[in-house]
């Protein structure tokens, strides 16, 4: 699987999950989140050659098409597969609130 | 929706489904399929700016991150959303067989 275990410990050039830290205030303009100040969101990057973690029959067909037509702009793309939530703390007036933000952290990628 | 109805009738520059015809023999090297000789597979292409048909909370965050960090390589990617099957005919000896190939035709796209 193109997950953090594999990708963070390798020098994989093809589609893999990469490290990305997002600072809520600086990178998103979200000043109201109290904790955490930011988080390891990660992102997906890298080419999707034929048979590299292809998502659907279509992805396989497109990767094969790409192999036969190397100059074509039609190619599978490296995108998130498994996403995890992030708990945050913010204040409503003086009262702290804990919220689970769904689908915030990329754990693995796929070629789609 | 970034579907064939919208995308094929517009000059949309952002993520949209584009026309692509795949010839089984020439483009994939699949000589064994009797009918059809090829099909309109389509493909997804175009940038994914902030708020453009974003798939998950993560896609929204990444698009917003990209807005604040325009030079970053982390950005959502335009990929298939709705896929449809394709019926094909091939021969096993002299006997024709009809098969549904699942997820072969792109009907719409999303930013993931």
């Amino acid at each position: 699987a193109l997950d953090t275990n594999y990708c963070f410990s390798s020098t994989e050039k093809n589609c893999c999950v990469r490290q990305l830290y997002i600072d809520f205030r600086k990178d998103l303009g979200w000043k109201w989140i109290h904790e955490p100040k930011g988080y390891h969101a990660n992102f997906c990057l890298g080419p999707c050659p034929y048979i590299w973690s292809l998502d659907t029959q279509y992805s396989k067909v497109l990767a094969l098409y790409n192999q036969h037509n190397p100059g074509a702009s039609a190619a599978p793309c490296c995108v998130p597969q498994a996403l995890e939530p992030l708990p945050i703390v913010y204040y409503v007036g003086r009262k702290p609130k804990v919220e689970q933000l769904s689908n915030m952290i990329v754990r693995s990628c796929k070629c789609s | 929706a970034l579907d064939t109805n919208y995308c094929f009738s517009s000059t949309e520059k952002n993520c949209c489904v584009r026309q692509l015809y795949i010839d089984f023999r020439k483009d994939l090297g699949w000589k064994w399929i009797h009918e059809p000789k090829g099909y309109h597979a389509n493909f997804c292409l175009g940038p994914c700016p902030y708020i453009w048909s974003l798939d998950t909370q993560y896609s929204k965050v990444l698009a917003l991150y990209n807005q604040h960090n325009p030079g970053a390589s982390a950005a959502p990617c335009c990929v298939p959303q709705a896929l449809e099957p394709l019926p094909i005919v091939y021969y096993v000896g002299r006997k024709p067989k009809v098969e549904q190939l699942s997820n072969m035709i792109v009907r719409s796209c999303k930013c993931s």
């Epitope: 109201w32 003086r94 | 708020i51």
Partner: antibody, heavy 121, light 107 residues
Framework: EVQLVQSGAEVKKPGASVKVSCKTS????????MNWVRQAPGAGLDWMGQ????????NYNEMFEGRVTLTADTSTSTAYMELSSLRAGDIAVYYC??????????????WGQGTLVTVSS | DIVMTQTPPSLSVSPRETASISCRAS??????????MHWYLQKPGQSPQLLIY???NLESGVSDRFSGSGSGTDFTLRISRVEANDTGVYYC?????????FGQGTK
């Protein structure tokens, strides 16, 4: 230029529901909280609640007894306020107002033009 | 809930004079070194507009004739060299405690 454009005036029967829209432009919709405030004829301002559009996270004023539902459509940068079980006391101008951005509860720096809701049998 | 009380309920001021409006909160609205108190003006037939943020910070685009002061429970909005265009209802608002609340207004 930041703009908040609300839907037109509504006339509803007692017991019915009303849904007011607030179409935004000129800023990043998922960066700010959106508040809803109402003003009865000749009266002051009452805060109804707020939504963070990226997740649909909401905070409501208990005064509205669970009758108010706030939603947001990030694809069109539009916020919505639905008020159910309408009664005569709900006759008011309803405003959407963007939070200043530093806190969840905050000052409001941009306001819609207001939507008059009339309840009449 | 924090109750905001404005005085006076209405005020008539001659042009070029100074006007003062008071707002008292039923409990302190100070937290983390800030006073969570803001001031708005609602001109006739218009939506409210933000004048002062966090007790004393002038909102951008607002005339410097407006100034805010105070902390804890007692706050004041001053309008110097009053103009006819300043006519309307002035509201204070706190966001230190949920629910956010407004004063009843000063006309």
């Amino acid at each position: 230029e930041v703009q908040l454009v609300q839907s037109g005036a509504e006339v509803k029967k007692p017991g019915a529901s009303v849904k007011v829209s607030c179409k935004t432009s000129g800023y990043t919709f998922i960066t700010y909280w959106m508040n809803w405030v109402r003003q009865a004829p000749g009266a002051g301002l009452d805060w109804m609640g707020q939504i963070f559009p990226a997740w649909g996270m909401t905070n409501y004023n208990e005064m509205f007894e669970g009758r108010v539902t706030l939603t947001a459509d990030t694809s069109t940068s539009t916020a919505y306020m639905e008020l159910s079980s309408l009664r005569a006391g709900d006759i008011a101008v309803y405003y959407c107002a963007r939070g200043y951005g530093n806190y969840a509860l905050d000052a409001m720096d941009y306001w819609g033009q207001g939507t008059l809701v009339t309840v009449s049998s | 809930d924090i109750v905001m009380t404005q005085t006076p309920p209405s005020l008539s001021v001659s042009p070029r004079e100074t006007a003062s409006i008071s707002c008292r909160a039923s409990e302190s609205v100070d937290s983390y070194g800030n006073s969570f108190m803001h001031w708005y003006l609602q001109k006739p037939g218009q939506s409210p507009q933000l004048l002062i943020y966090l007790a004393s910070n002038l909102e951008s685009g607002v005339s410097d004739r407006f100034s805010g002061s105070g902390s804890g429970t007692d706050f004041t909005l001053r309008i110097s060299r009053v103009e006819a265009n300043d006519t309307g209802v002035y509201y204070c608002q706190q966001n230190d405690e949920d629910p956010l609340s407004f004063g009843q207004g000063t006309k």
